[in-house]
Amino acid sequence: TQNKALPENVKYGIVLDAGSSHTSLYIYKWPAEKENDTGVVHQVEECRVKGPGISKFVQKVNEIGIYLTDCMERAREVIPRSQHQETPVYLGATAGMRLLRMESEELADRVLDVVERSLSNYPFDFQGARIITGQEEGAYGWITINYLLGKFSQKTRWFSIVPYETNNQETFGALDLGGASTQVTFVPQNQTIESPDNALQFRLYGKDYNVYTHSFLCYGKDQALWQKLAKDIQVASNEILRDPCFHPGYKKVVNVSDLYKTPCTKRFEMTLPFQQFEIQGIGNYQQCHQSILELFNTSYCPYSQCAFNGIFLPPLQGDFGAFSAFYFVMKFLNLTSEKVSQEKVTEMMKKFCAQPWEEIKTSYAGVKEKYLSEYCFSGTYILSLLLQGYHFTADSWEHIHFIGKIQGSDAGWTLGYMLNLTNMIPAEQPLSTPLSHSTYV
C-alpha cells in the first residue's frame, strides 16, 4: 500500500478589517486540537484590498462586489477547499463607518448590507459584517498583542524567541492609530478607573484583568488633518493657507465641500468667501506641532487626570506596543528603532519637514504623492498625540515599542476579534494540554 501524508488537522479563520482608508483581509490558521492554548493561532496571509475604505462606496455600492473579489478569491486559493465551509469569515468596520453612521444610519446600513450580500456569495461560513465599537477596537488590539507576546500563559510559549522580551507576565499596553480614530488601552497600576465607560474586565486563562481603554473618534491621522485644516482656514485672510505641516514648495487645492464633508470638522465649520483654497507648504515642525496642539482641549478635566477633551486617562504603566499607523508612519520615517530617543525623533522630524517637496518627491519616487505629502504632518501628529495627548515623556518614550508584526502576525484588532468570536480564549487556564493526535493513524 502507498504511504499517504495524513491531512493536517488545522482550522482557518478570516477577518476583514474595513478601515477608514482601506480594507485588509487576514487569514489565520491554528492546530485543531490546541484551540484553547495561548499563542497557537498565527496569520498565514494578509491581502490588502485595492481601493479606498468601504465608507467611500456610499454613492456606488454596486462596486463593493468587485472591490472585495480579489482578496476573497485569494482566500479561496490559500485555504484548502475541504476547509472552506467550516472557515468563519468576519468583517469588522471601524471609525470610517462610525462616522458614516453618524451622518446617516441608513447609508451605513446600505453599505453593510451590500458587503454582507457580497461576502455571502463565497463558500465560507460568513458570520456577518458589523461596525465594531471604539471600545472593542481598543480591547481586541490589546488582546492581540498580548496573546502574540505570550502574556496570557504561564506555560512555555510555542515560539522560542519573543521580541520585546520581559520575563514577567506584565501585559503590554496597546496604542493603535488609524485614519479616523486612535485607541489607547492598558492595565493601570492599582488605579481606580474613574470613568465606567473606559473600564473593561476580562478573565483570561484564569487571571483577571482590569483594563482601561478609550477610542478618540476623529483623532486618527487623516481626520486629525482635516480638523487641523478646518481650524486653520478659519483664520486665513484669503484662499491661501500657508501650512507648516507640509513641505516647502508643496501646493494642493482643497475643496471646502470636501473639508466639511466629515462630521469631524463640524465644530470648525463656517461660511467661507471661497469654494476652494490652496495649501502652500512651509515645512516648519515647531509651528506644525503648535497647530496640532490646538486640536487637544486640555483646559477641562472632570477627573483626577485626563488625556484631552475631558477624557479620563490613568497614569501610564508598563510597556506599550504602538501599531497600525503609529508603526507605518514611524517605519517610513525610519524612527522605529528602540535606540532612538524622543529628542532624536523630534530632531529628525524637524529636518524631514524642512526638506523641499521636489527633493522629497525625487527621494521617494515610488510612494503615492498623497501619502508622501502627509508624512510630515503624520509624524508630527504622532509626537504631539503621544507626548501632549497621552502624557508620555522623554523618559517613558523608551517604553513605546513600534510594532508591525509579532511572530509573523500583524499587530491590530483583527486577531483578538477572531479569538473572541471563535471562543478561543478561555476564561480559565486549561487543566492540561491535550495530546496531538495528528501523527497517529
Epitope: 490588502r48 454596486n62 480579489d70 456569495n121 515610488g366
Partner: antibody
Framework: QVQLVQSGAEVKKPGASVKVSCKVS????????MHWVRQAPGKGLEWMGR????????KYAEKFKNRVTMTSDTSTNTVYMELSSLRSEDTAVYYC????????????WGQGTMVTVSS | DIVLTQSPALAVSPGQRATITCRTN??????????MNWYQQKPGQPPKLLIY???SLASGVPARFSGSGSGTDFTLTINPVEADDTANYYC????????FGGGTKVEIK
Amino acid sequence: QVQLVQSGAEVKKPGASVKVSCKVSGDSITAYFMHWVRQAPGKGLEWMGRIDPDHERTKYAEKFKNRVTMTSDTSTNTVYMELSSLRSEDTAVYYCATERVPGFETDYWGQGTMVTVSS
Amino acid sequence: DIVLTQSPALAVSPGQRATITCRTNPTVDHYGTTYMNWYQQKPGQPPKLLIYLASSLASGVPARFSGSGSGTDFTLTINPVEADDTANYYCQQSRNLWTFGGGTKVEIK
C-alpha cells in the same frame, strides 16, 4: 497625477528576447494590478497578462504562458515584461496599464513601446 | 476563456446616434456585478476608458457616451455623435482576467 512611462522602441531578431519597462509616478505600483496588452499593426488589442506587485503574483494569457515573464520592482516603482523566443508576428506596440481600482473611475495606460522583430 | 464578439464597422452622420454591440460567451455577470468595460482608441494613442461595469461613465468622459446590457449582450451608445468620435471602440471583460473584443471602427460621414 498618475503617469506610466515605458521604455523606448526595440528592434530584435527572431529567437531573441525583449524586456520592456513601465515606470509609474504619482502612485505606488502596489495599489494596482499591472497589465500588459499588445497591438499588432492594424490589429486589435490583445491581453498578455498581469502582475500584482504587492505579492509578485502573476497571471498570463494561455497563448503567452511559456514565453512571457512579468516582474516588478517596488523600490523603483517599475514593472517589466519580458517576451522570449521572438517571431515576426510579435511585432507590435506593447502597452502597460493599471487596472481600474474600485472606488475610482479610471485607469492609466503607458504611451506604448514599439517592438519590431525582423531578421 | 471568455470570447467577445463585436460588430466590425459603423458609419454615422454627426448629430446621429451610434450603437456598437458586443456579445460575450459565457456571461460576464458575477454575483450581481457586470464586468464589462468599453474603450476608445485613436490612431497612435493608447486606449481610453469610457465605460466601466457595463454602465458607469469613467471620469472626464462626456455624457454623450452610455453603456447598457447585462449577461451576454452589451451596447455602447454615442448620442449625439461628433466628428471627434472617429476611432476604434473595444469592449473588454474583466470578470476573468481581461479579454478584448475585436474592435469596431466608427467613421463619421
